[in-house]
């Protein structure tokens, strides 16, 4: 008799999920010698243990604690770059500015970025057919709880000046419902973080508006100020030039505004 399987609204687990996580872990430890001590098989076992045989709408941060412990990593707390809705540029930036880190430049973020996973209650199977959608099914699903957990820890670790890259092409440049707006903003520690500096990335070639005056940026400023953290904002009018100038700061064209 075929076993009835729960149909969720979201895509199923990424194909080759175990192999991908394990391979990413091995690669990460190779390219980050300071993490060479990490046992990737143990990391995978802890990752698997967080969601296998558990109802995929009933996952808790506690489920991920063994993985968090194995993935403990010290990044310079004053070199953290947060981002919202502009991941690719943030990753390109830290690729060039190698002393700065996004969450996805840490081991745990590198393992999971762009992957989907879930299991089933009372079976050791991974569900490759469907996984819960955050909106349509439930918020306490394996992927959402993972990112909430690692994002909270990442924000809590930040100090001094924290940078955030925001997408100026979106209707809500700052979105209270994004991971940045709902988790990271509220977990910056005022006793450690002096300033949150927003970089608003412009999309249009001829867009010379000051997007730091956008109502949603003012809302962000208000939230941050109420938490006793200073706020500053910069327009990045030409993201392509910005990246080029990070790469080659001595270039003569890099003295003007970007």
């Amino acid at each position: 008799v075929p076993r009835w399987r729960q149909q969720w609204s979201g895509p199923g687990t990424t194909k080759r999920f175990p192999e991908t996580v394990l391979a990413r872990c091995v690669k990460y430890t190779e390219i980050h010698p300071e993490m060479r001590h990490v046992d990737c098989q143990s990391v995978w076992d802890a990752f698997k243990g967080a969601f296998i045989s558990k109802h995929p709408c009933n996952i808790t941060e506690e489920d991920y604690q063994p993985l968090m412990k194995l993935g403990t990593q010290t990044v310079p707390c004053n070199k953290i770059l947060l981002w919202s809705r502009i991941k690719d540029l943030a990753h390109q930036f830290t690729q060039v500015q190698r002393d700065m880190f996004t969450l996805e430049d840490t081991l745990l973020g590198y393992l999971a970025d762009d992957l989907t996973w879930c299991g089933e209650f009372n079976t050791s199977k991974i569900n490759y057919q469907s996984c819960p959608d955050w909106r349509k099914d439930c918020s306490n699903n394996p992927v959402s709880v993972f990112w909430k957990t690692v994002s909270r820890r990442f924000a809590e670790a930040a100090c001094d000046v924290v940078h955030v890259m925001l997408n100026g092409s979106r209707s809500k440049i700052f979105d209270k419902n994004s991971t940045f707006g709902s988790v990271e903003v509220h977990n910056l520690q005022p006793e450690k973080v002096q300033t949150l500096e927003a970089w608003v990335i412009h999309g249009g070639r001829e867009d010379s508006r000051d997007l730091c005056q956008d109502p949603t940026i003012k809302e962000l400023e208000s939230i941050i100020s109420k938490r006793n953290i200073q706020f500053s904002c910069k327009n990045i009018y030409r993201p392509d030039k910005f990246l080029q100038c990070v790469k080659n700061p001595e270039d003569s064209s890099c003295t003007s505004e970007i």
Epitope: V21, A23, R24, H91, Q95, V96, R98, D114
Partner: nanobody
Framework: QVKLQESGGGLVQPGGSLRLSCVAS????????MGWYRQAPGKQRELVAY???????NYADSVKGRFTISSDNAKNTVYLQMNNLKSEDTAVYNC???????????WGQGTQVTVSS
């Protein structure tokens, strides 16, 4: 499936130079990287150098200042310029393409580099 074709190994005296080339069937993009590993007899494979999609180079401490990795995106080719070679650089050098999204390593067939007088 990424295919890799290496060239440029050989025998060289200590202090000499060699240039390895590796042509890939796919360009480096996104978070993928291309680079070189080496394995000497009886030793573990080690990462020598790799380059990112934006052309950012990274090196093992043992080769810093002597080896230079570079890429020609138009030709999907990565080069490893090896100067001031030492006997401990003797190994089989393997070109590697790391596909981040798929979590897959692709390998060339390997090319022997021997540093000896």
């Amino acid at each position: 499936q990424v295919k890799l074709q290496e060239s440029g190994g050989g025998l060289v005296q200590p202090g000499g130079s060699l240039r390895l080339s590796c042509v890939a069937s796919e360009r480096i993009f996104s978070r993928n990287t291309m680079g070189w590993y080496r394995q000497a007899p009886g030793k573990q494979r080690e990462l020598v150098a790799y380059i990112t999609s934006l052309g950012i180079a990274n090196y093992a401490d043992s080769v810093k200042g002597r080896f230079t990795i570079s890429s020609d995106n138009a030709k999907n080719t990565v080069y490893l310029q090896m100067n001031n070679l030492k006997s401990e650089d003797t190994a089989v050098y393997n070109c590697n393409y790391w596909h981040y999204a798929a979590g897959r390593d692709y390998w060339g067939q390997g090319t022997q580099v021997t540093v000896s007088s």
